[in-house]
Every structure is written in structure tokens, then in C-alpha cells.
């Protein structure tokens, strides 16, 4: 995905649908790319990203990536197509309405990633284990 404020040319009129055959509309996501963050050892954090964008492609979802190494903590917020890997990982939770962080194995750093399918859902990133698949909110498969 091309970040906001970078102009692009888009001309494609195929109809995009979700797994149930419903027409998939684009959504609103936080889109600040990589920014330094103070989010650490918290159950949840706000992105503190002031840029919201309508994803260019209807199939794209909101993504957040939290990384911590010896030097700093960063938070990345973007739109991304869940059919394509991001940072070499599949977006397995793309249908969730909430951005529930899951740890991924990356050498030399702590790496968490989440994806979600409700407007601006990557503004609030959740690390707490109390949000698991027993949470009824996560059973809502929504594409808004």
C-alpha cells in the first residue's frame, strides 16, 4: 500500500467481495507508517497517529505493527491487503473488529502485529490476554 500524501493513479472497476460474497467497501484506517512510540507494558494503547485515510483498495484492512529493540519502540499503522503477507506474516485476524496484538518471531526485537476490519480499528491496539476468541466482539465478522 502506498502511504498517504503520496499521489497515485488507480483505475480498476472489478467488484471486490468478502468470503461471504458481500460487496467489500473500503474502510477508514490510521495511516502514519512508522512512528516512535511510548506504548510499553500496557494492556492497550492509542496509536497517537493523527492521519486517518480511506484505504485505496476495498479489500484492504487496518494493520498495526509494534516493535521494540534495544534502542526504541515504534508503532506502524497502515492499510494492507490481507491476501498478501505483511512483514513476511499472514494477516490471520483481518476479520476481527478489534486490533488484538499477537507476537511474531523476529530476531533481535520484540515484534507484535494486528489487523482488523472496522473503521479506524488500528487506533486502539490491544495487548491484553483477556481479549481472546471467547470475546463475543471477536466473533463478529465485519467488513465495514
Amino acid at each position: 500500500t502506498i502511504p498517504p500524501h503520496v499521489q497515485k493513479s488507480v483505475n480498476n472497476d472489478m467488484i471486490v467481495t468478502d468470503n461471504n460474497g458481500a460487496v467489500k467497501f473500503p474502510q477508514l484506517c490510521k495511516f502514519c507508517d512508522v512512528r516512535f512510540s511510548t506504548c510499553d507494558n500496557q494492556k492497550s494503547c492509542m496509536s497517537n497517529c493523527s492521519i486517518t485515510s480511506i484505504c485505496e483498495k476495498p479489500q484492504e484492512v487496518c494493520v498495526a505493527v509494534w516493535r521494540k529493540n534495544d534502542e526504541n519502540i515504534t508503532l506502524e499503522t497502515v492499510c494492507h491487503d490481507p491476501k498478501l503477507p505483511y512483514h513476511d506474516f499472514i494477516l490471520e485476524d483481518a476479520a476481527s473488529p478489534k486490533c488484538i496484538m499477537k507476537e511474531k518471531k523476529k530476531p533481535g526485537e520484540t515484534f507484535f502485529m494486528c489487523s482488523c476490519s472496522s473503521d479506524e480499528c488500528n487506533d486502539n491496539i490491544i495487548f491484553s490476554e483477556e481479549y481472546n476468541t471467547s470475546n463475543p466482539d471477536l466473533l463478529l465478522v465485519i467488513f465495514q
Partner: antibody, heavy 116, light 110 residues
Framework: EVQLLESGGGLVQPGGSLRLSCAAS????????MSWVRQAPGKGLEWVSW????????YYADSVKGRFTISRDNSKNTLYLQMNSLRAEDTAVYYC?????????WGQGTLVTVSS | QSVLTQPPSASGTPGQRVTISCTGS????????VSWYQQLPGTAPKLLIY???HRPSGVPDRFSGSKSGTSASLAISGLRSEDEADYYC???????????FGGGTKLTVL
Amino acid sequence: EVQLLESGGGLVQPGGSLRLSCAASGFTFSSYSMSWVRQAPGKGLEWVSWISYNGGSKYYADSVKGRFTISRDNSKNTLYLQMNSLRAEDTAVYYCARRIAAFDYWGQGTLVTVSS
Amino acid sequence: QSVLTQPPSASGTPGQRVTISCTGSSSNIGSNAVSWYQQLPGTAPKLLIYANSHRPSGVPDRFSGSKSGTSASLAISGLRSEDEADYYCGTWDSSLSGYVFGGGTKLTVL
């Protein structure tokens, strides 16, 4: 069939208040973000406000910030717009619409007239 | 003054192709997907194009949308009398943190 039905419009004096409602049916209301859009007589469309599916995030147009409040009751499948300190320039047909990235369904609108 | 600029009027004869432009900036059209809406006289607006160029089901393929840089356009081919309406472009503005519409274009079928 998706339906959005606005109500609560009417004649109000400048400085007065009004609460608009939008009753939604035909879809899982609690799964969708919702918006209010208005249209002054003979004028173009103006976005007013947006609320996320769970009410956790809200945005307002500068022209209504601090005066209007958007809210929702997912148990009643209803969207609200509380309008305070109304001005003559708030006179318009107010539409509720589904989503924000593309307003895919619209209500028929309710007319708000602010006049003394 | 609208954030997005559209021509106030456009016209064409039946069967013709008409294009309506929508010009913005890097903070709106340049970095966000664009939608187009049709408003027939006395009715609520209807979504015509979303995500720059996608048509909702039920919208004829005579309507097409495109976007390049900070401009978008709506093309209507094989113009019909029932296409006479107001057309609005719209998108999010990342600087204003709000949705913005063009001023609207009144299409007349001669």
C-alpha cells in the same frame, strides 16, 4: 432490505436544541460505522459527523464542533444527533448514512428549520 | 467554498459521453479513495462509485470512475435522460480529519 429512517426534525428558534434519530433495519447495525450528512436548501452536501461501530471514535465537521453530539444505541439499532445552540445556517435536510469511506445507504432525510 | 472543486454544470445529448472532474489536494484525493454520488431531483443521494472506480451492484456500467494524483473524474457514456441529476464527489481529508464533498455538478441532458 437495508432501511434508514430519520426523525426528529422540525422548526426551532436560533439558540434552541433538537435531537435527531435514525432507526436502522435490514442489517447488523452494531457492525457498521454511521454518519450524518446535511444539505441546506438548494445547496450541496455537507458531512456533519461520524461514529464508529461501537461508539468509541467520533468526528465532527468544524462547523458543528462543540455544538452537535453524535451517539448510538446498538441495542435499539438507532443513531442520534443532538444539536444544541442551533443557528440559521444549520437549516438543512439531515440524512443519516451508513459507513464513512463510501456512504452506501442513505435515509430519506429529515428537515431542520432554524428560524425566529 | 468546497474543499473539492467540481464544475457547477455539465451537459450532453442522449447517447453522448460526459465527464465530470473533481480536483482536490494531497491531503484528500491524493491520499484517499474517492466516491461519487448521484442525487436525482427531490431524492436522497445514491452511491454511484466507490474506491475510485468500483461500482456497487445495480449501477450500470455506463458509469465509470478514475483517479490520478489529486484529481478524480466520473464518466457517463451513452447518456440518458434519467441521468439528469446532481453529481457529487467525496473523500476523507486527512488534514481536516473529516469527510469532504465537492460542490456538486448539475448534469443536464439536452
